[in-house]
Interface confidence: medium
Amino acid sequence: SAPGEDEECGRVRDFVAKLANNTHQHVFDDLRGSVSLSWVGDSTGVILVLTTFHVPLVIMTFGQSKLYRSEDYGKNFKDITDLINNTFIRTEFGMAIGPENSGKVVLTAEVSGGSRGGRIFRSSDFAKNFVQTDLPFHPLTQMMYSPQNSDYLLALSTENGLWVSKNFGGKWEEIHKAVCLAKWGSDNTIFFTTYANGSCKADLGALELWRTSDLGKSFKTIGVKIYSFGLGGRFLFASVMADKDTTRRIHVSTDQGDTWSMAQLPSVGQEQFYSILAANDDMVFMHVDEPGDTGFGTIFTSDDRGIVYSKSLDRHLYTTTGGETDFTNVTSLRGVYITSVLSEDNSIQTMITFDQGGRWTHLRKPENSECDATAKNKNECSLHIHASYSISQKLNVPMAPLSEPNAVGIVIAHGSVGDAISVMVPDVYISDDGGYSWTKMLEGPHYYTILDSGGIIVAIEHSSRPINVIKFSTDEGQCWQTYTFTRDPIYFTGLASEPGARSMNISIWGFTESFLTSQWVSYTIDFKDILERNCEEKDYTIWLAHSTDPEDYEDGCILGYKEQFLRLRKSSVCQNGRDYVVTKQPSICLCSLEDFLCDFGYYRPENDSKCVEQPELKGHDLEFCLYGREEHLTTNGYRKIPGDKCQGGVNPVREVKDLKKKCTSNFLSPEKQNSKSN
């Protein structure tokens, strides 16, 4: 039978009355236009909603916007447009919300053509009050907060100037001209690229990479011949043009650009690109585009210095620079990533890794599903997940895969079951063990969200018709109840819940359409009375993550350690609560070959844990660049996976000798760098 229709599905008692008492409608006194919503702070209940409406006049477009504020998670809203002097706010800049619980908000206003600079509205009290500030420049980008100090802001101007404020946007100073891209690093450091000749586009590949650690008092040039740069985890990456041709290579620094090493990655040509798919303080996943317009490339995983890379996955789907990739970090279980590969016949297949890119496999076929006609063998097939690429292709996929760090093991995604992703209408699948096993959760496409750290899952059917029904599950998607939240169906536009999945409130956004007008409307439903009591010790059960063979002593060992979690029993209908903290018990494992990646010049044949020498490098000295010097690598083919905590057991030897020779191809050696002060 279909999910939710099994005999063992118990009804949640009196849920209709409980939810009806906790359903709050707000009709916005607005023409439809567009709406954007931002949460201000964590657990504050403060939501800002900006509605904008463009009226195209004969000569120009006239715009109006309204600002609304809620301080009860969206149950009630107050029109606070007068706090911003009824000014039209530019939606392309969004609402710049400060980090952590700073309570800071910056809105960028539309100004008339002849004005000297832009205008912002600033709040530092969770949008209770705003201060209008006229800028000495026209902003090109949204204001960017320093992650360490929310009083420090940076912005680029339409004239390519880099502007910095040290007092939360009250006063601004242009610290550099001719800037293409600027980013905050750690410790209030700013990294930026500059052009010397014409423009950012004209100088691509001839840009300079600069750093300031004192908000513009002094500068250091840390790279030349730069194409682009990026920050990921503790790594700073730059793609640098080669001296002789139009190829470029990745260089990496772990000391804010003082010293650089050339990454052992293939160089790329003009039409190719590099992309940092994911990075943490241990390692980085790097995509290197294949030559030609293939739409795929190779994923490499780095060592702990970001220098030596192992091939992780071939034919990785990634359409173009800034294009679409399905690469997804499953945040509900460590080490798990999902992505798509492009097979030889040009169909798309989903792959999953449970060990941070060490090995990739297909997703196991859900128990309650049959293979579709993409399958050559109807008894053997896999689950294939729809993500960004499917959404970009306008397939019937309303949402990307969803996982939350505090909803341990839960992954929800649209998918199809066969030999490849299908263009047929997808269903929604759930995994409760981080992607090892899957079950069909809902028939057809849905919007979905996780509340109360996984205690409740909420879903709304994706339909072109107006809707008035919401579905919810208190047992991780096994059984579903439906609740009619309004008599008058609305055209649904989105589900909104507080980031972090700790809330028990969900807002359903949409619009009503009548003969003469259409209006924005939101329904906020609080599930607190469905989960009547707080969870107790008896409501939780011990779960060993990554467990595939309970008989094996090393069962659950991933990246050198195993973790036991306390997880809510599916049968328990209770509140985890806003203060819920994931309880986990780690234990260290003995080292095995699985804890080592293949070193530079080595690879793992399929279904083998041993690393063997790449045939083309057999008998050659393995040399690579480190901090501008050439190194000689003596290895038996293994290196510890970054972040792996195993101890004892297998311990392959690895040694690096300094060859005391300069690397001719390292364009970022220290002597090419210089400093200057303002």
Epitope: D293, T294, G295, F296, L317, T319, L342, S343, D345, N346, S347, I348, S369, E370, C371, D372, A373, T374, A375, K376, K378, S390, Q393, K394, L395, N396, V417, G418, D419, A420, I421, S422, V423, M424, V425
Partner: antibody, heavy 129, light 107 residues
């Protein structure tokens, strides 16, 4: 040889339902999708939907959503198309057609589409009071 | 849905002459396009798939070209049995859609 044989002509009253069958032979029924296409008198071709013969999952054109039901019986290698709440504008010839591409989503170079390579002879459905 | 537009609606050609039929998509369909021939009282017959590949048993005088939004079916030298209605069909995104058809008649 590979062929699709459809059921005979039908005359129905408005509001009634019609169920057209399409029996496949000469190939493995479960390896190919089946599309249904109709053609009103003097008009062009109109795609109604597609059925996956293994799982039985379907995808219908929006226009027919709620009125059309496509099913299959793998034991007899037969696909069925039922259209309910008939109106006079449903008078048409209804075709089943083998759709071998499966429905694998495309990579950046586009999905390779093989076309509907085998067609039934057509079933004439007349809706008249 | 993707709208397919065929032109001309009718094409009058003498036997032995070349016929060029056009099909335009409202958005890119890549190469996911097929051409069909239909004669009165008969089911359609697949001529071209993948925008340019001839189906089994289709004579070499039929050729297809194009990708993205513009497609062409060319019949290099019309034979008497080629006078029929020709349809293009996209299968890039559901629902599959057909063009309105081009009738090739004897001049």
């Amino acid at each position: 040889q590979v062929q699709l044989v459809q059921s005979g002509a039908e005359v129905k009253k408005p509001g009634a339902s019609v169920k057209v069958s399409c029996k496949a032979s000469g190939y493995t029924f479960t390896k190919y999708y089946m599309s249904w296409v109709r053609q009103a008198p003097g008009q062009g071709l109109e795609w109604m939907g597609i059925i996956n013969p293994i799982g039985g999952s379907t995808s219908y054109a929006q226009k027919f959503q709620g009125r059309v039901t496509m099913t299959r019986d793998t034991s007899t290698s037969t696909a069925y198309m039922e259209l309910s709440s008939l109106r006079s504008e449903d008078t048409a010839v209804y075709y089943c057609a083998r759709d071998p591409s499966g429905i694998a989503a495309a990579g950046p170079a586009g999905r390779y589409y093989y076309g509907m390579d085998v067609w039934g002879q057509g079933t004439t459905v007349t809706v008249s009071s | 849905e993707i709208v397919m537009t065929q032109s001309p609606a009718t094409l009058s050609v003498s036997p032995g002459e070349r016929a060029t039929l056009s099909c335009r998509a409202s958005q890119s369909v890549s190469s996911n396009l097929a051409w069909y021939q239909q004669k009165p009282g008969q089911a359609p017959r697949l001529l071209i798939y993948g925008a340019s590949t001839r189906a089994t048993g289709i004579p070499a005088r039929f050729s297809g070209s194009g990708s993205g939004t513009e497609f062409t079916l060319t019949i290099s030298s019309l034979q008497s049995e080629d006078f029929a209605v020709y349809y293009c069909q996209q299968a890039r995104l559901g629902p599959w859609t057909f063009g309105g058809g081009t009738k090739v008649e004897i001049k």
